[in-house]
């Protein structure tokens, strides 16, 4: 914490300007009125303050707004945003996409993934849902940021907005996020023809259930291996060799390369070796001929 001193009369601050860069930390603390700082925040980013000086200014704002900064201040934080912690940001109420854009620009090139994720979260809460304008802003200014949102926040995305999401925006999404987004995509794209539908739904397929994957295998989609590898393990395991062959089409040869990786490895272990041999890829590890397969999961459910 900065020690408190009295401000010398000649150092009294009546407006936020470049002269402040010559103030020592304790002088800034003593001489800058927090309310004046808040009122003239739009000037701060144009002044080349040191990081130490920015610490003092942040401290001033924290004292003035212990419950969180108002959006009028947040919008003009500029490089002061780099000093904010996720805990600070959690106190904010942000509704303006201009504020979001401004802070996303500032954060570029800095290691601020936690702060950005929290900021986006606050924007979604402030706006009530993840609407099209917010998604457009995220995809334009922060590719991949969509996946920083929790499944709970993503659940507020209306299906009508899904069309604005690009494949690269989903690259860092985990299964729990895709579980939320996939059914929305399925609803949003349901009126498209088969081939067009597959192109649109493909980035979301990591959230698909078995029955949807089985249905795709009947559609001559020739799924690429990268998409297949992103499918849920649980969605792949029940597929037959014939279904996987149909699903992948000419890409089926790629199974050999991925033989040791999940979900291919786990799927191989569930297939009869005779069936695997029909692929002619030399896949090994299937159930030997003559063995009986008991599906205990279904038996358990029946008991």
């Amino acid at each position: 914490d900065v020690e408190r001193t009295t401000c010398p009369p000649e150092k009294e601050v009546h407006e936020i300007d470049e002269s402040l860069i010559f103030y020592k930390k304790r002088e800034l603390e003593a001489c800058v009125d927090a309310a004046l700082l808040a009122a003239q925040m739009d000037r701060v980013d144009a002044i080349p303050f040191t990081y130490e000086q920015l610490d003092v200014l942040k401290h001033k704002l924290d004292e003035l707004y212990p419950q969180g900064y108002p959006e009028s201040v947040i919008r003009h934080l500029g490089h002061l945003f780099l000093k904010m912690s996720p805990e600070d940001i959690r106190k904010w109420n942000v509704t303006s996409l201009e504020t979001l854009k401004a802070l996303l620009k500032v954060s570029k090139g800095h290691e601020m993934s936690a702060q950005v994720a929290t900021l986006i979260d606050r924007v979604v809460v402030g706006r009530g849902q993840l609407d099209k304008d917010t998604v457009d802003t995220l995809t334009a200014f922060c590719p991949g940021c969509l996946c920083s949102l929790s499944p709970e926040r993503l659940s507020s995305v209306p299906p009508s907005v899904i069309g604005a999401v690009r494949p690269q925006d989903l690259d860092t999404c985990g299964p729990r996020q895709l579980d939320v987004l996939y059914p929305k995509a399925r609803l949003a794209f349901q009126n498209m023809s088969g081939s067009e539908y597959f192109v649109k739904i493909r980035p979301f397929l990591g959230g698909a259930p078995t029955e949807d994957v089985k249905a795709l295998s009947q559609q001559n989609v020739s799924m690429d291996l990268a998409t297949f590898m992103k499918l849920r393990r649980e969605a792949v395991l029940p597929l037959t060799v014939a279904e996987v062959q149909k699903l992948l089409g000419p890409h089926v040869e790629g199974l050999k390369v991925e033989e040791q990786h999940s979900p291919v490895r786990d799927w191989i272990l569930k297939q009869r070796q005779d069936d695997l041999d029909t692929l002619g890829l030399g896949l090994q590890g299937g159930i030997p001929n003559g063995y009986l397969i008991l599906d205990l999961s279904v038996r358990e459910a029946l008991s």
Partner: antibody
Framework: QVQLQESGPGLVKPSETLSLTCTVS????????WSWVRQPPGKGLEWIGY???????QSNPSLKSRVIISVDTSKNQFSLKLSSVTAADTAVYYC????????????????WGRGTLVTVSS | EIVMTQSPATLSVSPGERATLSCRAS??????LAWYQQKPGQAPRLLIY???TRATGIPARFSGSGSGTEFTLTISSLQSEDFAVYYC?????????FGQGTRLEIK
């Protein structure tokens, strides 16, 4: 052949929480989406919400603040909790399977449980 | 939410005759509409999806038509087992919504 069976108390007191479970037998709960639908006596059907085996849900906004749908994959079951019930929540509650076929594309129901009547009364 | 309105509320038709049931959506649902049949004490049974495609095992006398906001379920020659309540359901958007039902009774 997959079958669905609802279970739970038939009588719930006002302001309490209604709890129902649907057991999926003859197949894995992981393959589809599963919904709850209710029907007040002599009235039409109302969709409550769905769940995926991973726990991902979507609920009807008219009930969302009171609804929790959960899943237990080890038991092949999914459940409904509806809090702060009133007499207006008296209904036959059905669990249902969403078709889940991309070739078909849709959120409609090809398999239903027999339904269980829940009465809200003190 | 999309409101589905069915008409008439009750339809009286003689066995062997044709029955025509209507369903109207408050906004376009494209062809994302399903029809169900429900008999007393039973769960609904899927008849039609995609506005016009019969579900597995549904007799050819049941047919669906329409798109956008106006839909029709036609039963060409009524059998005794067809007298029941019929519901339409849209799945163009969440929340999924049903019509209030049309009761088909013997004249």
């Amino acid at each position: 052949q997959v079958q669905l069976q609802e279970s739970g108390p038939g009588l719930v007191k006002p302001s309490e929480t209604l709890s129902l479970t649907c057991t999926v037998s003859g197949g894995s709960i992981q393959n589809y989406y599963w919904s709850w639908v209710r029907q007040p006596p002599g009235k039409g059907l109302e969709w409550i919400g769905y769940i995926f085996y991973s726990g991902s849900t979507q609920s009807n906004p008219s009930l969302k603040s009171r609804v929790i749908i959960s899943v237990d994959t080890s038991k092949n079951q999914f459940s409904l909790k509806l809090s702060s019930v009133t007499a207006a929540d008296t209904a036959v509650y059905y669990c249902a399977r969403e078709v889940g076929r991309i070739a078909v594309a849709g959120w409609f129901f090809d398999l239903w449980g027999r339904g269980t009547l829940v009465t809200v009364s003190s | 939410e999309i409101v589905m309105t069915q008409s008439p509320a009750t339809l009286s038709v003689s066995p062997g005759e044709r029955a025509t049931l209507s369903c109207r959506a408050s906004q376009s649902v494209q062809s994302n509409l399903a029809w169900y049949q429900q008999k007393p004490g039973q769960a609904p049974r899927l008849l039609i999806y995609g506005a016009s495609t019969r579900a597995t095992g549904i007799p050819a006398r049941f047919s669906g038509s329409g798109s956008g906001t106006e839909f029709t379920l036609t039963i060409s020659s009524l059998q005794s087992e067809d007298f029941a309540v019929y519901y339409c359901q849209q799945y163009n958007n969440w929340p999924l919504t049903f019509g209030q039902g049309t009761r088909l009774e013997i004249k």
